[in-house]
């Protein structure tokens, strides 16, 4: 078990690599950089020589006065103020904001959509498979097994309010204990984290974005982790979540009540249920045993049913079945009876894409994985490019203060918990903390939110999430009530738990300094990223989900082990960076150990390697899509990528060697002349940069 | 229109065997179940047994279990019915008839009737 | 195996006479009962099915009527067509079971 990674190479005061900077032209972050071009072009620019050793990205994001590279960048305004407007500029203006407004809000939408669409996606991949994991009988006795099965259905599945909802159906048909499905919501808590976590992998091409957008969203998945490795033991050993929800739940007079409400979804169904429409139920049938539900499609096909209540001749195995001693006869084959059927009929076809192609379930789920993460990552960057555009000066100003500032003295305590509520409101809102949390990466990407501030926002989404949970459960018929209420407040009361632990007292607040370091290492191994999501999410969850099938005692052999080395590296790590006097000369830093499992330059080399031979294709077909979107939107400043991959092709002609893979989407800092694209500014039109 | 054709009269000897076909038209064939009865001279109906052509499943009498054999041919829509070990009391018409399946309308259509004779 | 007993074997009747024909059961058959009519060299005509539910094309004249062990059929005017044979016949347990029959004369 390697420790920690370290960022070896981070430098904490760029300016000092840098030779020829000019007072004149200060090395801006790259945010400004980009939005820059209607800046008056007499202004000098010295071309400016990096030294070689370090990654462009820790040089040139950060400006130089400052040696955070968490703090936030200035989103500089280069567009001609109010004042200096003429009536057509003001009105031109007017319109473009507008105009913006507009299509933010487009973008918007069809980002949330797509989320709806690629949830989908996943149920018909995993769906059926996932629906299997429940039906597993050694989750009554394994807490760790419902755990690790909470958090591979809701990956598969990309919806914890589908996996709770078949939590929920097999609690009150009696297959599952309240008992037995706590671990299972913890893990549907944790694999809800997993959405914005690849929300925030869209952000790649900018390394102080990505380290931002990357620690934003893996702050979600730190708190669960962390929630989980705490409570989970507490749950096991005091089943305080089940006692304290079944006092509530005995507390209540139950009468069945109205329909939870949709919200968002009544803005996003009409789209989405042109696209593609699921049956829920069969997921959950799969889930309860239904040996005929394993063949029935997830693909919706039939909206408008007419179930109608019949007699229907049945055949029976013998005259003892017979519904009454006189409807009972024989055909000399079978024995038959007369049984009330309700009887479905069929009345008209839904109305969506896959209705009448007949595919199976898998090669619908592949198509729509594969449109649905593209429009996802479309609308992403179109989102963050207006953001970028819009967010400038003094609505930048105005917005990052109004979010990020504390209250004043001495209630500045309370503003966290105030955006825990507005998390939490939010959530409610667009009913899904999946939703809200992946709308929140990119802004703590293009530097609006701070991770601080996403911390408390994100815990109250946690909290939102459940509260819709709740409502549904008092909406929800009778047979299922108190199963789906408990189930509700067991997540309700699990993520308060949560909270409690990891946020009231400022040194407690673990996951931002988690995910900080996540974010570092991830800026600088952008592969790293990647193999996290796949460590924590899938290799960990179905590793356990194997041990725990072959018995509690290779499970506990092997966890053991496993547990006891990561306790050691923690201490280890603890006194090394606080005492490190206390140890011995050897055990003072990690240098004892080979290189590779202390430090990922190893392991970047061997990625490299595998990835070089990708990088040309990737980069033409990124230059042709580059020049496609500074054409459509008319700025040929947008597209950095294309500059890159020049770079690497000069690079490969003089050297005949593959470069690293993380450079390739490192920002170049050159001169506007260098790249040929000076054009003076339509004072007129352009009220600031797209 | 409903019709059940039989095949035509059959002279056997005593121990051989002998295969009365049921040619059927005018009606789905797999939804049917497909009934043998007989009637020996002067004497009253006997039922041997039935088949559902849709999925070959029969039952048959006990006292002609291990002598009969019924098939069905749905690409011809054809049942047949053969009774082996003849003896001279299985000289009989031999009917088939056709009963809805899933239904309680009895033997609703009956073919005309193969005459088998059984005689040294 | 369900015995079925039919009564009379046989009546001699006159044209737009009533005629009743009883069925009974060895045991309670609820109201699996069908009646055929085999008229002489013809094979058998389904007539009444379910106890009292007249097939389709069959005259108004024959009526089916009782429940569980005990049915008749009755022929409410009969017509010299009527001339045959009857069959009652139970469908309540396999093996199928057929009456001795009751042979319809005219005067």
């Known amino acids: 078990m390697a420790p920690w990674p370290e960022l070896g190479d981070a430098q904490p005061n760029p300016s000092k690599y840098l030779e020829g900077a000019t007072s004149q032209q200060p090395i801006t972050p790259d945010k400004s950089k980009e939005t820059n071009k209607t800046d008056n072009t007499e202004v000098p620019v010295t071309k400016f020589e990096l030294l070689p050793t370090y990654s462009t990205a820790t040089l040139i994001e950060e400006p130089t006065e400052v040696d955070d590279p968490w703090n936030l960048p200035t989103l500089q305004d280069s567009g001609i103020k109010w004042s200096e407007r003429d009536a057509k500029g003001k009105i031109l203006c007017v319109f473009q904001g507008i105009g913006r407004l507009i299509l933010l809000l487009g973008f918007l939408y069809f980002f949330v959509c797509s989320l709806d669409v690629l949830s989908s996606a996943f149920q018909l991949v995993g769906g059926k498979m996932a629906g299997q994991f429940f039906s597993n009988s050694s989750i009554m006795s394994n807490p760790l097994l419902g755990l690790v099965i909470g958090v591979l259905v809701t990956v598969f599945v990309q919806s914890s309010s589908t996996s709770t909802s078949i939590v929920v159906s097999m609690v009150a048909s009696s297959l599952l204990t309240v008992r037995a499905a706590i671990p299972i919501i913890m893990g549907a808590n944790i694999g809800t984290s997993i959405t914005n976590t690849i929300v925030a992998l869209m952000q790649v091409g900018d390394r102080s974005e990505f380290r931002r957008a990357f620690a934003g969203a893996t702050v979600h998945d730190f708190f669960n982790w962390l929630s989980v490795l705490v409570l989970l033991p507490v749950e096991v050993a005091t089943h305080y979540l089940e006692v304290v929800t079944q006092l509530i739940v005995e507390s209540f007079h139950f009468k069945n009540g109205e329909d939870a409400p949709d919200l968002l979804k009544v803005i996003t169904k009409p789209f989405t249920k042109l696209i593609v429409q699921l049956d829920k139920k069969v997921i959950s049938q799969i889930a309860m045993n239904d040996e005929t539900a394993k063949n029935k499609s997830l693909v919706k096909i039939w909206c408008k049913t007419f179930t109608n209540m019949t007699q229907m001749n049945v055949t029976v195995p013998s005259m003892a079945n017979c519904t009454s001693h006189s409807l009972c006869w024989t055909d000399g084959i079978q024995i038959w009876t007369m049984k009330n059927v309700t009887y479905k009929e069929n009345i008209a076809k839904c109305q969506h894409i896959f209705v009448n192609f007949h595919l199976p379930d898998l090669a619908v789920g592949i198509i729509l994985l594969i449109i649905s993460l593209l429009v996802l990552c479309g609308c992403l960057i179109m989102i963050v490019k207006i953001l970028g555009s819009v967010l400038k000066g003094q609505v930048a100003t105005v917005i990052k203060k109004t979010i990020n500032t504390d209250f004043p003295f001495p209630f500045a305590w309370l503003t966290g918990y105030l955006a825990i509520l507005v998390g939490a409101g939010m959530t409610f809102i667009v009913q899904s903390s999946s939703v809200f949390t992946s709308a929140l990466t990119p802004l703590i990407g293009i530097g609006v939110i701070t991770i601080e501030r996403a911390y408390p926002l994100t815990l109250g989404s946690n909290i939102g999430t459940t509260t819709t949970a709740i409502l549904a459960a008092l909406a929800s018929p009778g047979n299922t009530l108190r199963s789906s209420l408990q189930i509700a407040l067991c997540h309700f009361f699990f993520n308060i738990s949560g909270i409690l632990l990891w946020y009231p007292i400022p040194f407690t607040r673990l996951p931002i300094r988690m995910a900080k370091g996540l974010g570092n290492i991830s800026a600088k191994y952008r592969w790293f990223a990647v193999f996290y999501l796949i460590i924590f999410f899938f290799l960990i969850p179905l590793t356990v989900f194997g041990l725990s099938l072959a018995g509690w005692p290779v499970l506990v052999g092997v966890g053991v082990p496993v547990v006891f080395i990561i306790i050691l590296v923690l201490c280890l790590r603890l006194l090394q960076s606080r005492c490190p006097r206390v140890l011995p000369k050897k055990l003072q830093n990690w240098n004892f150990l080979p290189l590779c499992m202390h430090s990922l330059k190893p392991w970047d080399a061997v990625i490299s390697k595998f990835t070089g031979p990708f990088q040309m294709p990737c980069c033409c077909c990124c230059r042709v899509c580059c020049r496609v979107c500074c054409l459509l939107c008319g700025c040929p400043k947008c597209c950095r990528c294309s500059k890159c991959c020049q770079d690497l092709e000069e690079g490969q002609e003089a050297q005949g060697v593959p470069v690293k893979a993380p450079e390739t989407f490192d920002n170049i800092t050159i001169s506007r002349e260098a790249q040929g694209e000076v054009r003076a500014p339509d004072s007129k039109t352009e009220c600031t940069a797209l | 229109q409903v019709q059940l054709v039989q095949s035509g009269a059959e002279v056997k000897k005593p121990g051989s065997s002998v295969k009365v076909s049921c040619k059927t038209s005018?009606?789905?064939?797999?939804?049917?179940?497909i009934h043998w009865v007989r009637q020996a001279p002067g004497q009253g109906l006997e039922w041997i047994g039935g088949?559902?052509?849709?999925?070959?499943?029969?039952n048959y009498k006990q006292n002609f279990r291990g002598r009969v054999t019924l098939t069905a041919d749905k690409s011809t829509s054809t049942a047949y019915m053969e009774l082996s070990s003849l003896r001279s009391e299985d000289t009989a018409v031999y009917y088939c008839a056709r009963w809805r399946n899933a239904y309680y309308s009895a033997m609703d259509s009956w073919g005309q009737g193969t005459t088998v004779t059984v005689s040294s | 195996d369900i015995q079925v007993t039919q009564s009379p074997s046989s009546l001699s009747t006159s044209v737009g006479d009533r005629v009743t024909i009883t069925c009974t059961a060895s045991q309670d058959v609820g109201t699996a009962v069908a009646w055929y009519q085999q008229k002489p060299g013809k094979s058998p005509k389904l007539l009444i099915y379910w106890a009292s539910t007249r097939h389709t094309g069959v005259p108004e004249r024959f009526t089916g009527s009782g429940s569980g062990t005990d049915f008749t059929l009755t022929i409410s005017s009969v017509q010299p067509e009527d001339v045959a044979t009857y069959f009652c016949q139970q469908y309540r347990t396999s093996p199928l079971t057929f009456g001795v029959g009751t042979k319809v004369e005219i005067k």
């Open positions: 088949i559902i052509p849709n999925n070959d499943v029969t």
């Open positions: 005018g009606f789905f064939f797999t939804e049917y179940i």
